[in-house]
Each structure stands twice: as structure tokens, then as C-alpha cells.
């Protein structure tokens, strides 16, 4: 007889996770001389150690720290860039801009960036039918558990001057429930960090409003501003140009807005 | 807030070169421009170039290509402008100015002025 | 590379008394977003520039409202209302539109 599987909301572990994880750590540390020391099955064992067996809506940090140890990285600290709900213009402007880093960029952003993953209680296996989805069903799921604990690691690496990208297209260009207005935010060190320069991706072609003096970003001035944190804000006009520029800074069509 | 300090007077023999320093305090420095302008005694402003220190490649004027090099040092939140092959015309006060508008990528607006250095270019 | 021209190049003025500056570009500051790319500063003695107006017609922070800006395209204005001892100085406009920035030649207000 079959045993009965728990139905979650959300869609289940992307196929072939294991081989997926595997490879990208193999290829990062083949990138990046300074992970070569990485033993890629012992992540791969920590990886799958912090869910596997485990109830899938009672994952903690703490399941996660063996492979946070084995994932300890360190980035330039003044040379991190934040974004929320615009991660394709954050990382392409990361691979242009080498020297400034997305949490994707590093090993434990780059292994699980766009994967999902979640076992079963008391069993070894891997859940690819479903798996919790954050608000219909949990928040303490596999996923969700993972990206607060390297987010917050993130921030709390970050000096100096922290950047973020926001995407002005949506009504909410700060958004307090985002994993950036959730986690990061509140995990920046004061004490560190001087200020927040916050980006603002204009959508419209024509469109000159200074979103910077939207509430929501007025509200995320007034956050960090209690945390005794500098605030600042850039319009970015021409999401397309503003990347050709970063390519090409001397072009002369770049010394106008974008 | 923002502070913009230049380095002092300068002396120079045609021929020489003269690099100005203009160090930044209080607020961002990194994707603000900084530009530099001259004044010649008794003169106008002239737009040199500039530069926005996260990307750390400069734009120079047509006139002054080949001549100068805009740098910055975002560690000591630092621009530099080096003029080379001087001449008795380069007799000027050199101003740091860095833009102040919430506009990514604007050379202009410059709400902060250095104190202004003057390099004097005489044999 | 956009030619800024100004007029006139000596301005008397008497306090309380309005003045107007004019400056013309050799091609049109207005782009396709809508702003004019034209910047107002003065020059007092002995100091640095200091912005006073910026597309076309904003007020820096700080600058009294005696100052007003107006124009576009290629002919613009500066105005101030009431002439105060403390605004003599050289008076520029620049263009912000494309490279090289340039400045016009300056006017020069000065007590009568």
C-alpha cells in the first residue's frame, strides 16, 4: 500500500537537485581561486543534511549552519550590492561591474539561486512532488530558512557603503515583507555600515519622476535612519543605458542622466 | 555635510606635470561624479572632466584629452586630476565640484565646490 | 560642443531694484524627458561657485526665492527680484545636457 505523501503548495524540488548542486559548486570553485579549497561533497552533505529527514515546515537556521561553515566566504565588504524583486539587472551589472558582489555571486548564493528543494520526515528522500510554499503553507520550509540565514550573513558582512537595487515598476519600490526589508535591513551593522545608497530601475521609457521621493522609499529612509545609518537614492533612468555606460564609461552619451 | 578639500598651491616649469588631489567627507562618494573646472585669471569656468569613482573610468573635455587623467581612490574617498605637458595658459585655479542630484550618471548639478587650488605655470 | 552665450556682460544694479540675466545655447537643452539641461551659478569674490538653479528652473536648497529661472530650449533666464547687496558676484549659466559641459562667459553684477 502506498504510503501517503503530504501535498504542499508549492512546486516540488527542481530535478535533478543533487547533480545541479554539485556541478555549480565544482564550476564556482573552478572560477574563483579563492573556494579551491572547498571540498564540494562535503557541501553537498551539509546541503542535504539541513532538510533531509527533517518536517519540511520545521527547518531552522540552525540546521544550516554546517554548510554556512563550509560556505564561509569572504567578499570586499564595501563592495556589496542588495536588490529586491530585480535580481536579473543586479547580477547583470555584477558581471560587468566585477569588483562588486550580489549574494548570488558568491558559493552559497550561486548553489541555490532559482532551485527549490524540501524533503520528508523520517525518510531519506527528496520531496520532487511539492514542498511548502511560504504563505500558503509555511515559512519555516527548506527554502525560505536558507535564504534568511545567508541574507542576514550577507548584511551583516556588509561596510561602508551598502547598495541596493530596487525595482520602481512595482506600487510597493520598498517592500517591508521583501527578504531585503525582512532580513537585510535589519541586519546591516550600524557600526559598520555608513550608509544605504539605494538604486531606483525606472520601467518607462519616458518616465522622469523622481521615484526616489516615493513613500515606500522615504519609508526605508526613515528605518534606516532609526538604525543610525546614512540614506541616499539614485533615479536610474534607462536601465539599458545605464548598463552600456557601466561597460563604457567614457562614452560622452554618458555624462547625462540615464 | 559634504566636505570637498583640495590640496594646496602649486608651482610648475612648462613641460611638468601637476596632480591635484580633492578628498571628500561626509555623505556617498562612490557613485557621485566628480568633475573638475578651471578658471584662468580674470577668466571664465572651464569643464575639464570627471569621473564617478564606482565605475573608474573618467570623461575628459575634447580639449583636454591626451593631457589629463581624472582618477579617484574610493578607500580614501579621494579625486585626482593630473595635468600633464603644462603651459603658461594652464595658469589657473582648479575646482573640484561633485554633483548632488538624485539623477545616476549627471555630470552637473554641483551643489559642493572644492576650496579651489591654483597652479601657477611659470619658468 | 554647445556654445553658451550670455548678456550682458556687466550688470549695474541698484538694491531692491530687479535685474535679469539672459543666456542663449547653440542648440537646444530641453530632453526628451522633459528637463532643460541648463544650470544657473554665481561666483562671489574670493569664493568657489555656488549653485543656484538647476533645470532650468529649480531652486538649489538653500537659495532665497528672490531667484527664479525660467525658460527653454535655448533661451533662458535668470531672474532676481530684489537685488541685495550680498548677490554681487560673476553670474554663469551651464549647459548639463551633453559633453563637454560648458559654461556661458559670466555676467557681472555689481552695485550702482
Known amino acids: 500500500v502506498p504510503r501517503w505523501r503530504q501535498q504542499w503548495s508549492g512546486p516540488g524540488t527542481t530535478k535533478r537537485f543533487p547533480e545541479t548542486v554539485l556541478a555549480r559548486c565544482v564550476k564556482y570553485t573552478e572560477i574563483h581561486p579563492e573556494m579551491r579549497h572547498v571540498d564540494c561533497q562535503s557541501v553537498w552533505d551539509a546541503f542535504k543534511g539541513a532538510f533531509i529527514s527533517k518536517h519540511p515546515c520545521n527547518i531552522t537556521e540552525e540546521d544550516y549552519q554546517p554548510l554556512m561553515k563550509l560556505g564561509t566566504q569572504t567578499v570586499p565588504c564595501n563592495k556589496i550590492l542588495l536588490w529586491s524583486r530585480i535580481k536579473d539587472l543586479a547580477h547583470q551589472f555584477t558581471q560587468v561591474q566585477r569588483d562588486m558582489f550580489t549574494l548570488e555571486d558568491t558559493l552559497l548564493g550561486y548553489l541555490a539561486d532559482d532551485l527549490t528543494w524540501c524533503g520528508e520526515f523520517n525518510t531519506s528522500k527528496i520531496n520532487y512532488q511539492s514542498c511548502p510554499d511560504w504563505r500558503k503553507d509555511c515559512s519555516n520550509n527548506p527554502v525560505s530558512v536558507f535564504w534568511k540565514t545567508v541574507s542576514r550573513r550577507f548584511a551583516e558582512a556588509a561596510c561602508d557603503v551598502v547598495h541596493v537595487m530596487l525595482n520602481g515598476s512595482r506600487s510597493k519600490i520598498f517592500d517591508k515583507n521583501s527578504t531585503f526589508g525582512s532580513v537585510e535591513v535589519h541586519n546591516l551593522q550600524p557600526e559598520k555600515v555608513q550608509t544605504l545608497e539605494a538604486w531606483v530601475i525606472h520601467g518607462g521609457r519616458e518616465d522622469s519622476r523622481d521615484l526616489c521621493q516615493d513613500p515606500t522609499i522615504k519609508e526605508l529612509e526613515s528605518i534606516i535612519s532609526k538604525r543610525n545609518i546614512q540614506f541616499s537614492c539614485k533615479n536610474i533612468y534607462r536601465p539599458d543605458k545605464f548598463l552600456q555606460c557601466v561597460k563604457n564609461p567614457e562614452d560622452s552619451s554618458c555624462t547625462s542622466e540615464i | 555635510q559634504v566636505q570637498l578639500v583640495q590640496s594646496g598651491a602649486e608651482v610648475k616649469k612648462p613641460g611638468s606635470s601637476v596632480k591635484v588631489s580633492c578628498k571628500a567627507s561626509g555623505g556617498t562618494f562612490s557613485s557621485y561624479a566628480i568633475s573638475w573646472v578651471r578658471q584662468a585669471p580674470g577668466q571664465g569656468l572651464e569643464w575639464m572632466g570627471g569621473i564617478i569613482p564606482i565605475f573608474g573610468t573618467a570623461n575628459y573635455a575634447q580639449k583636454f584629452q591626451g593631457r589629463v587623467t581624472i582618477t579617484a581612490d574610493e578607500s580614501t574617498s579621494t579625486a585626482y586630476m593630473e595635468l600633464s605637458s603644462l603651459r603658461s595658459e594652464d595658469t589657473a585655479v582648479y575646482y573640484c565640484?561633485?554633483?548632488?542630484?538624485?539623477?545616476?550618471?549627471?555630470?552637473?548639478?554641483?551643489?559642493?565646490w572644492g576650496q579651489g587650488t591654483l597652479v601657477t605655470v611659470s619658468s | 560642443d554647445v556654445v553658451m552665450t550670455q548678456s550682458p556682460l556687466s550688470l549695474p544694479v541698484t538694491p531692491g531694484e530687479p535685474a535679469s540675466i539672459s543666456c542663449r545655447s547653440s542648440?537646444?537643452?530641453?530632453?526628451?524627458?522633459?528637463?532643460?539641461?541648463l544650470e544657473w551659478y554665481v561666483q562671489k569674490p574670493g569664493q568657489s561657485p555656488q549653485l543656484l538653479i538647476f533645470l532650468g528652473s529649480n531652486r538649489a536648497s538653500g537659495v532665497p526665492d528672490r531667484f527664479s529661472g525660467s525658460g527653454s530650449g535655448t533661451d533662458f533666464t535668470l531672474k532676481i527680484n530684489r537685488v541685495e547687496a550680498e548677490d554681487v558676484g560673476v553670474y554663469y549659466c551651464m549647459q548639463a545636457l551633453q559633453s563637454p559641459l560648458t559654461f556661458g562667459g559670466g555676467t557681472k553684477v555689481e552695485i550702482k
Open positions: 565640484a561633485r554633483d548632488s542630484s538624485s539623477w545616476y550618471f549627471t555630470y552637473g548639478y554641483f551643489q559642493h
Open positions: 542648440q537646444s537643452l530641453l530632453n526628451s524627458n522633459g528637463y532643460n539641461y
